[in-house]
């Protein structure tokens, strides 16, 4: 009784192209599948960035793969070819593996890519991001800046450089069509005369680095005697209701602070006839239904009553 | 909310200077370029300049380069334009006007400032 | 410098019509696969409002009966239907590069 063997995938590589992050990993059958001609041959593979503790593990009938990677670090891969049980009478035959690595070489020393890197999504409209240059480079050094996300044929440069000194220290993205929910890939290399410099990736997705804009038209309606109902708008964008959180900061003659966070534009506040001043401001958050992060908004304009029993009035700013 | 305020109307000597001013609120101020456009009466728009207050790097149109300075006080939300040499050709509206990068336009303007150089 | 030629420099239109103008340019707008061509309505005694910006993407709360098209050296702005607030000015404007420039203006009238 033979043993039954099958041999891993042949050509297995890491092909880069150009999506700064973005891999393919790509391999061709086996040697000798002749024995297997009714068989669907299945593959198992595993990669990680070096470094990484743990590998992701896919297994498909196809004969590539595309995932995202850090090119801050190395890749390894491996990959073993799998005879399903129903091909061999019983047990399931795996190959033995076939691995490749794959990384960029960097030039430059650490120290000379760039610092402090900084993006924020601006209302869910302005991708804006911004960096300090390397540590110990020369003026002459200046960085560019690539992005891309799957939807754009090939990686982009910044269309609109923030400069300081004549170096580029930011930039201001063109409008990100259908951009969000999906990795995005930025790398920013430089060039200089005297030394190479090197280069830095980041990936991050855009829906988790919003900051929208604070709520608008704040108002007080007094609902019963020891009630105030404060409202506000949403902002002014494309942000919709349903992904908002508020918090809210309310003080009450100059002396209770009272904080909440609330999910809809309204918050109704217990207070007593002697209320002579009222004030509060709301900022805004995109919540956990539309982003899995989010950066508070800046405070709203503060809205005030004083000097009149606020039972008597429906205050609107 | 957002707004870009500027006075109405100034009137000047011929060969005097003028600062015109454009005070900006409902946004964050150093996110946005900001361009300076001139518009004489019945004729076409002029684009003078603008300014990124965020590093206050400037790019000017070659023919208002000896006429405009492009300033901005980041502490005011204020960015400013002085026009010296004053003629009677530097009569116009200027508008300051706000733009994300160059991809998205010019989205927000000021009412503009009438400008009237005369004697 | 790119210099923006519109046509026609005046025109009338019926309400409910569609009114369509052009503008071409002295070289391609075309950047980074952007087109940077905006358009702009201004009204007596007010500051212009943006429409559209690059080409074809519609600014903040323009309504949708405004569009327009065009890559490279030459673009137009639609409007359809016709109505009555229509009536202005129409500027196109390069951003692709400094100086930005604007075109001679086409003024839109009902017929």
């Known amino acids: 009784d033979t043993e039954i063997k099958v041999n891993p995938p042949q050509d297995f590589e890491i092909v880069d192209p150009g999506y700064l992050g973005y891999l393919y990993l790509q391999w061709q059958p086996p040697l000798s599948l002749d024995h297997f001609k009714e068989c669907t041959v299945e593959y198992e593979l595993k990669y990680r960035n070096i470094g990484s503790e743990t590998w992701k593990t896919i297994i498909t009938k196809n004969l590539h793969y595309k995932d995202g990677f850090d090119l801050n670090k190395g890749i390894e891969a491996k990959i073993h070819t799998l005879l399903p049980w129903q091909c061999t009478n019983g047990s399931e035959v795996q190959s033995s593996w076939a691995e490749t690595t794959y990384w960029i070489s960097p030039q430059g020393i650490p120290e000379t890519k760039v610092q402090d890197m900084d993006c924020v999504y601006y209302n869910w409209q302005y991708l804006l991001c911004s960096w300090k240059p390397g540590i110990g480079v020369l003026l002459d050094t200046n960085y560019n800046l690539f992005y891309w996300y799957e939807g754009l044929d090939h990686a982009l440069q910044c269309v609109d450089y923030i400069k300081a000194d004549g170096q580029n220290i930011g930039c201001r993205f063109p409008y990100l069509e259908a951009s969000d929910y999906k990795d995005f890939y930025i790398c920013v290399n430089g060039s200089s005369e005297n030394k190479p410099i090197r280069s830095s990736y980041f990936t991050f997705q855009l829906q988790n680095i919003v900051k929208p804009l604070p709520p608008v038209y704040l108002t007080f309606t007094r609902e019963s005697s020891c009630e105030i109902k404060l409202k506000w708008s949403i902002p002014l964008g494309p942000i919709p209701a349903r992904c908002f959180d508020y918090e809210i900061e309310i003080r009450e003659d100059d002396t209770t602070l009272v904080t909440a966070t609330v999910e809809n534009e309204t918050y109704t506040l217990k207070t007593t006839n002697e209320t002579r001043q009222l004030c509060f401001v709301v900022r805004s958050k995109v919540n956990i239904y539309c982003s899995a992060d989010g950066i508070w908004s800046e405070w709203s304009d503060k809205q005030c009553w004083e000097g009149e029993d606020l039972s008597k009035k429906t205050l609107l700013r | 909310q957002v707004q870009l305020q500027q006075p109405g109307a100034e009137l000047v000597r011929p060969g005097a200077s003028v600062k015109l001013s454009c005070k900006a609120s409902g946004y964050t101020f150093s996110n946005y370029l900001m361009n300076w456009v001139k518009q004489r009466p019945e004729q076409d728009l002029d684009w003078i300049g603008r300014?990124?207050?965020?590093?206050?790097?400037?790019d000017y149109n070659q023919n208002f380069k000896d006429k405009a300075i492009l300033t901005v006080d980041k502490s005011s939300s204020t960015a400013y334009m002085q026009l010296s040499s004053l003629t009677s050709e530097d009569s116009a509206v200027y508008y300051c006007?706000?733009?994300?990068?160059?991809?998205?336009?010019?989205?927000?303007w000021g009412q503009g400032t009438s400008v009237t150089v005369s004697s | 410098d790119i210099v923006l030629t519109q046509s026609p420099a005046s025109l009338a239109v019926s309400l409910g019509q569609r009114a369509t103008i052009s503008c071409r340019a002295s070289e391609s707008v075309d950047n980074y696969g952007i087109s940077f061509m905006n358009w702009f309505q201004q009204k007596p005694g007010q500051p212009p409002k943006l429409l559209i910006y690059a080409a074809s993407r519609q600014g903040s709360g323009v309504p949708a009966r405004f569009s327009g098209s065009g890559s490279g050296t030459d673009f137009s702005l639609n409007i359809h239907p016709m109505e009555e607030d229509d009536t202005a000015m129409y500027f196109c404007q390069q951003s692709k590069e400094v100086p930005w420039t604007f075109g001679g203006g086409t003024k839109l009238e009902i017929k």
């Open positions: 006007a706000r733009g994300y990068g160059t991809a998205y336009g010019v989205d927000y």
């Open positions: 300014i990124d207050p965020y590093d206050g790097d400037i």
